[in-house]
């Protein structure tokens, strides 16, 4: 099977490595612009040179291309609890992360939020905390996951699922409770 | 085929508390991440509320935190959205959505939404 190209592919498949078809003129390929600028003029001719102007401050473009226009400096998402970890220059857009002792979560494919990872309080780190995924933690006896928090068993109630870790405690709480009964 | 439904909205006084909810269909609903969104009269949409599939991950705008809480019941299928001291700014539709797994997109599917009208 050919995979389905688009009209820009096309055109430019047709150019070798670096070049693409001019808009005007399917036997003219142009040099492209490098990364950092963008395309002012088309080249007048073959062998002549493509007008490419570099990239106006909050704008970048980050590989070599034919585009009209630079695209917009992403901003880092406050409101996420995002931190700029580098600013945009011409040729690199922002990068984003999160603060020390945090991880991501994405909420979709370009969106995250910074979480505070896990200190595993009453219970051992089994997996460190890392950029993508919280620490995973194991809890102390007399205690359960709950929402990657390790929990006092007394706060187990039987419809959950911590009674099966929790099992001899609520036996000990219930017992506690018979033999006040005496 | 995916389909969600909004109920609970009405006409409600300021400080007043309100709960929608949204009953979902057509997806395995506890493999995705749901949220609310609102859109004022003549204003443009504004996220309010995300929660992750097991409700370990909530977001919530800044305009909405300490008064809201999303929550989700995996068991039955349903989305909903806890809204106390409600104010006359959050006057808007409130709609439903299912966020994109993947592409550019934060949502792939939105409900037909509820009206929430905060006034005395």
């Known amino acids: 099977l050919v995979p389905h190209l688009g009209d820009r592919e096309k055109r430019d498949s047709v150019c070798p490595q670096g070049k693409y078809i001019h808009p005007q003129n399917n036997s003219i390929c142009c040099t492209k612009c490098h990364k950092g600028t963008y395309l002012y003029n088309d080249c007048p001719g073959p062998g002549q040179d493509t007008d490419c102007r570099e990239c106006e401050s909050g704008s970048f473009t980050a590989s070599e291309n034919h585009l009209r226009h630079c695209l917009s400096c992403s901003k880092c998402r406050k409101e996420m609890g995002q931190v700029e970890i580098s600013s945009c220059t011409v040729d690199r857009d922002t990068v984003c992360g999160c603060r020390k002792n945090q991880y991501r979560h994405y909420w979709s494919e370009n969106l995250f939020q910074c979480f505070n990872c896990s200190l595993c309080l009453n219970g051992t780190v089994h997996l460190s905390c890392q950029e993508k995924q919280n620490t995973v933690c194991t809890c102390h006896a007399g205690f359960f996951l709950r929402e990657n928090e390790c929990v006092s068993c007394s706060n187990c109630k039987k419809s959950l699922e911590c009674t099966k870790l929790c099992l001899p405690q609520i036996e000990n709480v219930k017992g506690t409770e018979d033999s006040g009964t005496t | 085929e995916v389909q969600l439904l909004e109920s609970g909205g009405g006409l409600v006084q300021p400080g007043g508390s309100l709960r929608l909810s949204c009953a979902a269909s057509?997806?395995?609903?506890?493999?995705?991440?749901m949220g609310w969104v609102r859109q004022a009269p003549g204003k443009g949409l504004e996220w309010v509320s995300f929660?992750?599939?097991?409700?370990?991950?909530?977001y919530y705008a800044d305009s909405v935190k300490g008064r809201f809480t999303i929550s989700r019941d995996n068991s039955k299928n349903t989305l909903y959205l806890q809204m106390n001291s409600l104010r006359a700014e959050d006057t808007a539709v409130y709609y439903c959505?299912?966020?994109?797994?993947?592409?550019?997109?934060?949502?792939?599917?939105w409900g037909q939404g509820t009206l929430v009208t905060v006034s005395s």
């Open positions: 057509g997806f395995t609903f506890d493999k995705y991440q």
């Open positions: 959505a299912q966020l994109s797994v993947q592409g550019s997109n934060l949502f792939d599917y």
């Open positions: 929660i992750d599939s097991n409700g370990h991950h909530t």
